[in-house]
């Protein structure tokens, strides 16, 4: 058993039929010695008396808020949560496996630049009685500070009969060094509590591996005289690291016909303009990627040819 | 050329060669995003690799103030990786494919290090750790880790030379 926060404790249980469970001793936080009784949750049934209560925790029915009282007055509370271990593996019931980029991916994180700011998100089908707490650091043995905000519900989607809820959190490395080559990964730890179930999820990454620039901005077309060609121009996104002579991007320009089956023409360039042939009803799209490190491409910025 | 007295390197040549190094490092190990090599107990194998750290002066301001600190650090790293790529980690079993970019990568590391420090001038170089994995699968894993680490190193080097070419060239 360990303390998650004040008056909240996590009991780690091997979860299998007829498992013996864990013996837990609760102590009433009071100077009183006599006349103390214990109850669980809303029930008025007295579970025991005395300053300590010994219980055998085997299942969710044994978890919950234990309260010690004296003469009708509440003295203190202890909330017991369960962390299930089945076949040697901690349960992952609360979050959905996003399966990208690989199985057992519960947390996904992205950064728009090298400033040390990043966003992580996760999915669940659970709508109520759910809390998240996020901690992060650079490295684990001698951790350097990363500050995370509160996790918030960022999207709701309907998936068949069920809804899916997306939560996200923003974190910022306290002493980020955008130009350095990272040697220690960022660690992100999410504590999830649904009713009386506790689970924890972790992710470890280098900022360079989760970079995904915003799409190029101010995408414009300039027709060239007496030609089907156009000059496409764009700018670096505002959120990208500066100076651009140091933090450079490379770009992919695509001409796409109306039908998805039509052949796509693609041009790669380090410049912020390109000359392409604009077909009728086609659209021109541009996306960006770090020039020197192959992390994710940005989403496309698009304009119609006409 | 970057001479240990402080003259400027051939920024544009260094820029071109370092960008080529980035391309080669990724073509040598393209599936890097799909393998989480940090799960494989990376500390003991790649902790000794020279990293370009915060105090090494490789940020835009540091380059403007005195690019020599940074260039020396890059040079150390280039020599380190050049030696690793020439070691039995890469020459031993399992053999690299004949068209593997590792050979080109090795040559380009050497080429860039020579651009930074011509014959007859010596900066301190870092000791290469003795990494001689006994099993072929260990060697394969170590190659992946070294290439992954190299990708990060050459990305920073390429940024340095791109910025130098744009802002510090005579």
């Amino acid at each position: 058993i360990w303390e998650l926060k004040k008056d909240v404790y996590v009991v780690e249980l091997d979860w299998y039929p007829d498992a013996p469970g864990e013996m837990v001793v609760l102590t009433c936080d009071t100077p009183e010695e006599d006349g103390i009784t214990w109850t669980l949750d809303q029930s008025s049934e007295v579970l025991g008396s005395g300053k300590t209560l010994t219980i055998q925790v085997k299942e969710f029915g044994d978890a919950g808020q234990y309260t010690c009282h004296k003469g009708g007055e509440v003295l203190s509370h202890s909330l017991l949560l369960l962390h299930k271990k089945e076949d040697g593996i901690w349960s992952t019931d609360i979050l959905k496996d996003q399966k990208e980029p690989k199985n057992k991916t519960f947390l996904r994180c992205e950064a728009k630049n090298y400033s040390g700011r990043f966003t992580c998100w996760w999915l669940t089908t659970i709508s109520t009685d759910l809390t998240f707490s996020v901690k992060s650091s650079r490295g684990s043995s001698d951790p350097q500070g990363v500050t995370c905000g509160a996790a918030t519900l960022s999207a709701e989607r309907v998936r068949g009969d069920n809804k899916e809820y997306e939560y996200s959190v923003e974190c910022q490395e306290d002493s980020a060094c955008p130009a350095a080559e990272e040697s220690l990964p960022i660690e992100v730890m999410v504590d999830a509590v649904h009713k009386l179930k506790y689970e924890n999820y972790t992710s470890s990454f280098f900022i360079r591996d989760i970079i995904k620039p915003d799409p190029p901005k101010n995408l414009q077309l300039k027709p060239l005289k007496n030609s089907r060609q156009v000059e496409v121009s764009w700018e670096y996104p505002d959120t990208w690291s500066t100076p651009h002579s140091y933090f450079s991007l490379t770009f992919c320009v695509q001409v796409q016909g109306k039908s998805k089956r039509e052949k796509k023409d693609r041009v790669f360039t380090d410049k912020t303009s390109a000359t392409v042939i604009c077909r009728k009803n086609a659209s021109i799209s541009v996306r960006a990627q770090d020039r020197y490190y192959s992390s994710s491409w940005s989403e496309w910025a698009s304009v119609p040819c006409s | 050329r970057a001479v240990p007295g402080g003259s400027s390197p051939a920024w544009t040549q260094c820029q071109q060669l370092s960008q080529k190094l980035c391309t080669l490092a990724w073509s040598a190990h393209p599936l890097v995003g799909h393998m989480d090599l940090r799960e494989e107990g990376d500390e003991e194998t790649t902790n000794d690799v020279p990293h370009i750290q915060c105090g090494d002066g490789c940020d835009p301001q540091g380059l403007r103030d005195n690019s020599q600190f940074c260039l020396q650090r890059i040079h150390q790293g280039l020599i380190f990786y050049e030696k690793l790529l020439g070691s039995d980690i890469f020459t031993g079993e399992p053999s690299l494919l004949p068209d593997s970019p590792v050979g080109q990568l090795h040559a380009s590391l050497l080429g860039l290090s020579q651009l930074l420090q011509p014959e007859g001038h010596h900066w301190e170089t870092q000791q290469i750790p003795s990494l001689s994995p006994s099993q072929p699968w260990q060697r394969l894993l170590l190659r992946f880790k070294i290439l992954r680490s190299l990708q990060a190193f050459v990305a920073v080097a390429a940024r340095v030379f791109a910025h130098g070419a744009a802002t510090l060239s005579p």
Partner: antibody, heavy 117, light 108 residues
Framework: QSVEESGGRLVTPGTPLTLTCTVS????????MIWVRQAPGEGLEWIGI?????SAYYASWVNGRFTISKTSTTVDLKMTSPTTGDTATYFC??????????????WGPGTLVTVSS | FELTQTPSSVEAAVGGTVTIKCQAS??????LAWYQQKPGQPPKLLIY???KLATGVPSRFSGSGSGTQFTLTISDLECADAATYYC???????????FGGGTKVVVV
Amino acid sequence: QSVEESGGRLVTPGTPLTLTCTVSGFSLSSYTMIWVRQAPGEGLEWIGIISAGGSAYYASWVNGRFTISKTSTTVDLKMTSPTTGDTATYFCARGSGTYTSDYFNIWGPGTLVTVSS
Amino acid sequence: FELTQTPSSVEAAVGGTVTIKCQASQSIDSWLAWYQQKPGQPPKLLIYSASKLATGVPSRFSGSGSGTQFTLTISDLECADAATYYCQSYYDANAGYGFGGGTKVVVV
């Protein structure tokens, strides 16, 4: 502590109807409330709940046909466009106060809604 | 999400024992309640958290199970136990909520 439903009557299909659940002896700001219906001779079917904080959650079949809201002492169930299939006794019940998705220990007697042309 | 109750009806003698099963289509941990309903009356809470007896409910009623399989057992049957019994999941309003189809208990 009690709850009581009212507003059930005979309506024609498509005529909006609001049922009201009036509570006494406890505060709605501390408990989840549920609306459940039971067609003649059938089982219990949950429609939706409204949390202590005022968030409403609905069964997947509801699709906007019902809306739950509350004041300090009442919980309303609005039937936007009733059909004959909505003929049932409608129950309101109070949760235990432990969770938003809760079990229910205080029930009203129910109010009968008949939808017929 | 579905809760399947079996059997749909059962007949037993006074003093006998009745077992009603409730199966969830996904794990709901121990978040299951049992209710008793008599004709013309609202449901009455018997058991919550799969096995905890509600206030004032005789100990002849007991609940067990967790995950997806749950059981309500009524022992020493009395005539007053003739009613329809419902299980209810309260795991989550989106990912596991609702009532079973009911089991009618006839006491002979």
